[in-house]
Interface confidence: medium
């Protein structure tokens, strides 16, 4: 069937559009064309006959068709008129006639589209704004976008005139956005440039910065004012009442009780014409005094007196805060704290309480420290100590001996010669002493505060002969491969050389043995029971020499793993048991047995007389040395068989 | 014009001694205590000793207990701070800082501060 | 000895803009913690004592609050010049110990 089709069926206006014809019929005279629905000879574009290949124009021919062979015409610069139907009249060589019709629209290319509003500047919650898209185009549909997002659902936004005016009733600060509208047609989209809405809203209530309202006096008062609004506020101050400033921002400096008062910021809006105002009460305080710290005993004296620190001045609503020694307070049960923690009492001082001790205060006002208060404890004297420690001293060298003992305040000192007072020094000096500066040497050390006395005796030897030595040590009786021992040469003499022998021989040579303190001690690391020798020291000036008595170093070890004897392990019936154990030990260990892991005695001998297969079983010995804590024990499998079953079995003791 | 002035940084081996000066002026110097605080390359702030107006309270940190020494000359308006067996973690800014009028234990006042490097 | 934690460790923010930093402390040290503000190459520079109190000539825009083991300093419409490292200290017992620092810098 013959049929028209339009390429394409929306034309724009100034485009071309082709009228195609589909299925034409073979052996054809010619065809025309014709605007409208009907072959009418008034409304003929052109004609055309094949065998001449001759194109007729008619009355609507407007010079912008061309006809092609196929039937198919095209229309150039297409205008508005152009719209509609197209018919095409076949004539074929039998004389018979064939029609078709077909149509194509023809819209505007749209212009780009604008967006008028009836309200520049609306007011938040009183004012609506109508948008309207223009120009006014038939034919077109109309869309509208907000922030580039198609409009959303509200009760508050409207459209109307075909889509082309948006209404937005009782506009709020949150409708300040970019509007856009754009109109379609089959042919063409366009978009305007965005319109921002400018709601007028405010002022809302002001806010007033910081929050804080207590203030201390000689602080900066440094208040800020804001408040939402379009355009922005105009700010005023009134403090009471009073007009103060038009600003945002109100500073005080130095501020004094007297600044205390009712501070108003009010906000204006000069477009919406509104007022609001917030109020803040400012309370300033005066500077409250710089903590310090009280003491009800200035001078206490150690392990006698407490003493109570109280942290000045009393407040209400304060917490009170201690240190000691840049530290919070240990816990002590000497140290107690009042009930509102102003008062700390330290009970029987001691030298270590000195401090610095340091109290604060804490409250919404203010924040304090003290100065540091240190403690003045008297204590001592402590018994004095005399230096050198040398006892012997040869004729003709001077003697001079020192003391001192702790003590708060420092210790007055005095020396006593076998009971006479000599003179009120810390230091003693006698030149060129002879045997008659023998005798006892008598430091008195005396604290005027506490009227407390201590003295040191120490006896002095001067003879050209020097003393027999002893030998003193610090552990009598050391543990193998644990302790350590120091022999120290006694007594300690001013120009003598210290030897040692052991066993009668020199010392050998051995990181375990080690002189020090001028030779006058000798100490032995981890000590071992060949340690336990015969240890002799000796001294010497250039006019004498003498020895120690031997000391015998007692080491205690052990005990070792010990030893079953006899070794046998088999055993006939109706033989005696003999067992006996042995262990190296220092003191002798304590034994005890165990058979097949039940007690037995506490002995070093265990006898069983007329033993039997019944007897068979694990024997152990078990080892205990009390000096040393330790412990050994060994175990023996003893097998008794019944009477001549077995060759070269022990018949017992 | 309140102002600390530190000197006597430079490069000291490790194991050696070192000697910073402070000179205080445009306060009283005898009536407020006096800090050292360093700052090591690209660290945060670290504490290192304080001196109390007469000498009687001294405090130092762990890290330099028993090596560094501070001491004061008050007619003199200067803080000292003796740092011996210097080790490469002391490479640091040394300032001097001044504890507030009022007791508290914060610095409000630091010198420019003076360079310290160890390193052999 | 009481530890301090400073967070964020870095910070970019732009002129205008409103910004706070925080800082945690180990156990209660009260109101006893300072701010200071180090420019690069400078000496640090006391800003806040006592948590809140702002020290002698520092510009309103900052404040400090807290207590207890809380605390963090607000600095609102950043000018040019507060770009650059801030450290928060306590001033309660020894050894007064720093944190980290937060490094403010321009967006």
């Known amino acids: 069937k013959l049929t028209i089709e339009s390429t394409p069926f929306n034309v724009a206006e100034g485009k071309e559009v082709l009228l195609l014809v589909h299925n034409l019929p073979q052996h054809l005279f010619g065809y025309s064309w014709y605007k409208g629905e009907r072959v009418d000879g008034n409304r003929q574009i052109i004609g055309y006959v094949i065998g001449t290949q001759q194109a007729t124009p008619g009355p609507a021919y407007s010079g912008r068709e061309i006809i092609y062979p196929n039937a198919s015409l095209l229309i150039q610069n297409i205008i508005q008129n152009d719209t509609g139907f197209y018919t095409l009249h076949v004539i074929k060589s039998d004389l018979v006639n064939e029609e078709a019709t077909g149509q194509f629209r023809v819209y505007p290319e749209l212009p780009k589209p604008s967006i008028s509003s009836n309200n520049s500047k609306p007011v938040e919650d009183k004012d609506a704004v109508a948008f309207t898209c223009e120009p006014e185009t038939q034919d077109a549909t109309y869309l509208w976008w907000v922030n580039n997002q198609s409009l959303p659902v509200s009760p508050r936004l409207q459209l109307s005139n075909g889509n082309r005016t948006l209404t937005l009733f009782n506009v709020t600060r949150n409708d300040t956005a970019s509007y856009k509208c754009e109109t379609q047609n089959p042919v063409s989209a366009r978009r305007s440039d965005s319109v921002i809405l400018n709601v007028l809203y405010g002022p809302d209530a002001p806010t007033i910065s910081p929050l804080n309202t207590s203030y201390r006096s000689g602080e900066n008062l440094n208040l800020s004012c804001h408040a939402a609004s379009n355009p922005p506020a105009q700010y005023s101050w009134f403090v009471n009442g009073t007009f103060q400033q038009s600003t945002q921002e109100l500073f005080i400096p130095n501020i004094t009780v007297n600044n205390s008062g009712s501070y108003t910021c009010q906000a204006h809006n000069s477009d919406t014409g509104l007022n609001r105002t917030t109020v803040t009460t400012i309370t300033v305080y005066a500077e409250p005094p710089k903590p310090f710290i009280t003491s009800n005993n200035s001078n206490p004296v150690e392990d006698e007196d407490a003493v109570a620190l109280t942290c000045e001045p009393e407040i209400q609503n304060t917490t009170y805060l201690w240190w000691v020694n840049n530290q919070s307070l240990p816990v002590s049960p000497r140290l107690q704290l009042s009930n509102d923690n102003r008062t700390l009492t330290l009970l029987s001082v001691t030298r270590n309480d000195v401090g610095p001790y340091e109290c604060g205060i804490q409250n919404e006002l203010s924040v304090d420290h003290s100065d540091p208060v240190i403690l003045n404890v008297l204590y001592g004297p402590d018994d004095p100590t005399i230096s050198p420690s040398y006892t012997y001293y040869r004729p003709g060298v001077n003697l001079s001996l020192s003391c001192h003992a702790a003590s708060n305040p420092p210790a007055q000192y005095s020396w006593l010669i076998d009971g006479n007072i000599q003179q009120h020094t810390q230091e003693l000096f006698i030149s060129n002493i002879t045997e008659k500066n023998s005798g006892l040497y008598t430091c008195q050390a005396n604290n005027s505060a506490s009227g407390h006395s201590r003295t040191t005796v120490k006896t002095i030897t001067v003879s050209a002969e020097l003393p027999k030595p002893s030998i003193s040590s610090n552990n009598s009786k050391p543990v193998e491969d644990k302790d350590a021992v120091a022999f120290t040469c006694e007594p300690e003499a001013q120009n003598t050389t210290y030897l040692w022998w052991v066993n009668g021989q020199s010392l050998p040579v051995s990181p375990r043995l080690q002189l020090s303190n001028g030779n006058r001690t000798l100490t032995l690391f981890n000590v071992t029971r060949n340690d336990a020798r015969a240890y002799v020291c000796g001294i010497q000036n250039s006019v004498s020499a003498n020895r120690s008595d031997p000391v015998t170093l007692d080491v205690l070890y052990g005990p070792d793993t010990p030893i079953i004897s006899p070794p046998d392990s088999s055993y006939l019936s109706g033989a005696n048991l003999n067992l006996s154990c042995h262990s190296a030990s220092n003191p002798s260990p304590q034994y005890s047995w165990r058979i097949n892991g039940i007690p037995q005695q506490h002995t070093q001998v265990l006898f069983i007389a007329k033993i039997t297969p019944n007897n068979n079983g694990t024997y152990a010995c078990f080892v205990s040395n009390l000096a040393t804590g330790r412990n050994n024990s060994i175990v023996k499998s003893i097998t008794v068989s019944a009477s001549g079953t077995s060759p070269g079995l022990s018949a017992g003791a | 014009d309140v102002q600390l002035v530190e000197s006597g940084g430079g490069l000291v081996q490790p194991g050696g001694s070192r000697e910073l000066s402070c000179a205080a002026s445009g306060f009283t110097f005898s009536s407020f205590g006096m800090h050292w605080v360093r700052q090591a390359p690209e660290r945060g702030l670290e504490w290192v000793a304080y001196?109390?107006?007469?000498?009687?309270?001294?405090y130092y940190a762990d890290t330099v207990k028993g090596r560094f020494t501070i001491s004061r000359d008050n007619p003199k308006n200067t803080l000292f701070l003796q740092m011996t067996s210097l080790r490469s973690e002391d490479t640091a800014v040394y300032y001097c800082?001044?504890?507030?009028?009022?007791?508290?234990?914060?610095?409000?006042?630091w010198g420019a501060g003076t360079t310290v490097t160890v390193s052999s | 000895d009481i530890q301090m934690t400073q967070s964020p460790a870095s910070l970019s923010a732009s002129v205008g803009e409103t910004v706070t930093i925080t800082c945690r402390t180990s156990e209660n040290i009260y109101s006893y913690l300072a701010w200071y503000q180090q420019k690069q190459g400078k000496s640090p520079h006391l800003l806040v004592y006592n948590a809140k109190t702002l020290a002698e000539g520092v510009p309103s825009r900052f404040s400090g609050s807290g207590s207890g083991t809380q605390f963090s300093l607000k600095i609102i419409s950043l000018q040019p010049e507060d770009f650059g490292t801030y450290y928060c200290q306590h001033h309660f017992l020894s050894p007064w110990m720093f944190g980290g620092g937060t490094k403010l810098e321009i967006k």
């Open positions: 001196i109390s107006i007469g000498s009687d309270i001294i």
């Open positions: 800082t001044r504890r507030s009028y009022r007791s508290y234990w914060y610095f409000d006042v």
